[in-house]
């Protein structure tokens, strides 16, 4: 069964989202130390940006917009040529539509002129400076920044933002970097200190964890990567489920193998941990589906729905595990491990 | 690394059955729908068909349906497409491919087989 | 069958400057799970195909961003920001939603 994770962790997202938000975009000023009135525009920007992130409900939209802004920060860190930042625009873009489904549109507006004066801001600094070991150590701190369950914990942390924030505000000049690096100390403790519910490279949606793999094995293989990573393929348990996961395969264009199959009994679909398929879940199928052409017994997400699919293929996979308490009792709050890695292919 | 090692270039005469083969590396063989592409000089591309080496079944496009037979032999990782009663028609350049199943693609080219059918 | 149309037929280029081929096709290529599976293709100059776009508009690993994808329905357009030398070829237009599966005739692209 899925484990809760405790309620101070819904009741503080507000908080989580600003800090993630600030460091996310700190991320990528720390990478252009060159031009100190530029950083200050930016420094503005996040400002306002972080107050109208901490104001809003929604945490599952929401979310969605914080992934699609770490990729922008991403983005933005690797791609200094004014030429390559397409991909920013597209990231935009997709922000806005998702913008334009929440409530609240008034504060979306808000956050998305922010964003888009934040966008042009950067689009105009030049090219990134030798800051790679900084922006290497913020990317470790935003990932474990993203979960932050406790209130007291939170403060600490957005305290240090605060003053590396400053600093970096002050220093134009390389030489006085050595400032940088204590703050990031300070701060790299701070987290290290915090639970993690879900591991590094992980997605975190409703108390449980999601693996979204990058390379591609069998339906069978995928369960074995599953199971050697202490998950199991997924299982779909609800509507708002399946929406978070046919929007994460069908936005990264992959066909992704999921834990449903009709191999026991051909036209009965079973989930791998036994579990029947529910009627009500049969409207995920696309149309025509399942067609069993060819014997096809796994199920796949594909494009809008669900398609089956002959299960000695090569897809992406999705695994799924409940997210971690944290508890102190239960000795959860460990240090930031590396990612589990993808299981090398079969 | 992916790589498709097709057979080289052959001459029959008309109406002599001819085979050709496609040996593939470097991912699981089994895990891969295997494709045929036609170009005939100085023209375009035809998809032929397909072959899944896991159990041998195979897709034809139903304008080759009675010119081309596809088969594997999983021992080695080949799969093979004997073209029957060849004319001048079936003169061309001859591409297996592999279809990704994760992005639905022809994500791997093997270099090319040519035939040339003349008497 | 889906019969797949490019134009023009040869794109004369120089080198810097930016071009853009033409791709329709006879019917709706969208799929039954709500995709297009509308790709392109670059033939270079004796070699075999290889893959530049799927799915309409997503650059496939390794491609370079100057290359663009565009369109929906029965209309699709392959754009080139600006113009190198390894970019001269015959580019081929696909379709994958519909069997049989369907090339275009192609476009040559090559140096004025």
């Known amino acids: 069964q899925v484990s809760k994770v405790p309620s101070s962790i819904s009741q503080e997202q507000s908080r989580q989202d600003a800090i993630y938000q600030n460091l996310t975009q700190l991320k990528a000023a720390v990478g252009e130390l060159s031009e100190k009135s530029k950083l200050q525009e930016i420094y503005q920007e996040l400002t306002q940006l972080k107050a109208a992130v901490g104001e809003l409900p929604e945490k599952s939209k929401l979310q969605e917009i914080y992934q699609e802004l770490t990729r922008l920060k991403a983005a933005v860190g690797e791609l200094p040529e004014k030429s390559k930042l397409q991909e920013i625009y597209q990231e935009l873009t997709w922000l806005k539509a998702a913008v334009g489904e929440l409530p609240e549109k008034s504060k979306m507006q808000e956050i998305y002129q922010e964003l888009t004066r934040l966008k042009a801001a950067v689009g105009e600094l030049p090219e990134k400076s030798k800051q790679q070991e900084i922006y290497q150590e913020l990317t470790r701190l935003k990932a474990a920044v993203g979960e932050l369950p406790e209130k007291s914990k939170q403060q600490e942390i957005y305290q240090e933002l605060t003053r590396l924030k400053a600093a970096v505000g002050e220093l134009p000049e390389k030489s006085k970097q050595q400032e940088i690096y204590q703050e990031l100390t300070q701060l790299k403790a701070a987290v290290e200190r915090l639970c993690h519910p879900c591991p590094w490279e992980w997605t975190f949606f409703q108390g449980n964890c999601y693996f979204m793999s990058n390379s591609q094995r069998n339906w069978h293989d995928s369960i074995t990567a599953c199971k050697e990573v202490g998950a199991q393929l997924v299982v779909i348990k609800s509507a708002e489920e399946q929406n978070f996961l046919q929007l994460q395969s069908s936005r990264s264009n992959r066909f992704t193998w999921m834990g449903l199959s009709d191999l026991n009994q051909e036209g009965t679909w079973q989930w791998v941990d036994g579990s029947p398929l529910l009627p009500s879940f049969k409207q995920y199928w696309n149309r025509g589906e399942p067609n069993n052409v060819g014997e096809e017994d796994c199920a796949e997400f594909s494009g809008n729905g669900w398609n089956d699919d002959k299960c000695n293929l090569a897809k992406f996979w999705i695994c799924k595990k409940s997210a971690a308490s944290c508890s102190r009792d239960e000795e959860q709050f460990l240090s930031p491990a590396p990612a589990t890695p993808n299981p090398p292919p079969a | 690394q992916v790589q498709l090692q097709q057979s080289g270039p052959q001459s029959v005469r008309p109406g002599a059955s001819v085979k050709i083969s496609c040996k593939a590396s470097?991912?699981?063989?089994?895990?891969?729908?295997m494709g045929w592409v036609k170009q005939r000089p100085g023209q375009g591309l035809e998809w032929i068909g397909m072959?899944?080496?896991?159990?041998?079944?195979?897709r034809l496009n139903q304008e080759f349906k009675d010119k081309a037979t596809l088969t594997v032999d999983k021992s080695s990782s080949t799969v093979y497409m004997q073209l029957s009663s060849p004319t001048s028609e079936d003169s061309a350049i001859y591409y297996c491919?592999?279809?990704?199943?994760?992005?639905?693609?022809?994500?791997?080219w093997g270099q090319g087989t040519t035939l040339t059918v003349s008497s | 069958d889906v019969l797949m149309t490019q134009s023009p037929l040869s794109l004369p280029v120089s080198l810097g400057d930016k071009a853009s081929i033409s791709c329709r096709s006879s019917?709706?290529?969208?799929?039954?799970?709500?995709?297009?599976?509308l790709e392109w293709y670059l033939q270079r100059p004796g070699q075999s195909p290889k893959l530049l776009i799927f799915?309409?508009?997503n650059r496939f690993s390794g491609v370079p961003d100057r290359f663009s994808g565009s369109g929906s329905g029965t209309d699709f357009i392959l754009k080139i920001s600006r113009v190198e030398a390894e970019d001269l070829g015959v580019y081929y237009c696909?379709?994958?939603?519909?069997?049989?599966?369907?090339f275009g005739g192609g476009t040559k692209l090559e140096i004025k």
């Open positions: 491919v592999r279809r990704n199943g994760g992005y639905y693609v022809f994500d791997s």
């Open positions: 470097g991912y699981s063989f089994t895990s891969y729908w």
């Open positions: 072959i899944d080496p896991f159990d041998s079944e195979s």
């Open positions: 019917q709706n290529i969208v799929h039954s799970n709500g995709d297009t599976y």
């Open positions: 799915k309409v508009s």
């Open positions: 696909f379709q994958g939603s519909h069997v049989p599966w369907t």
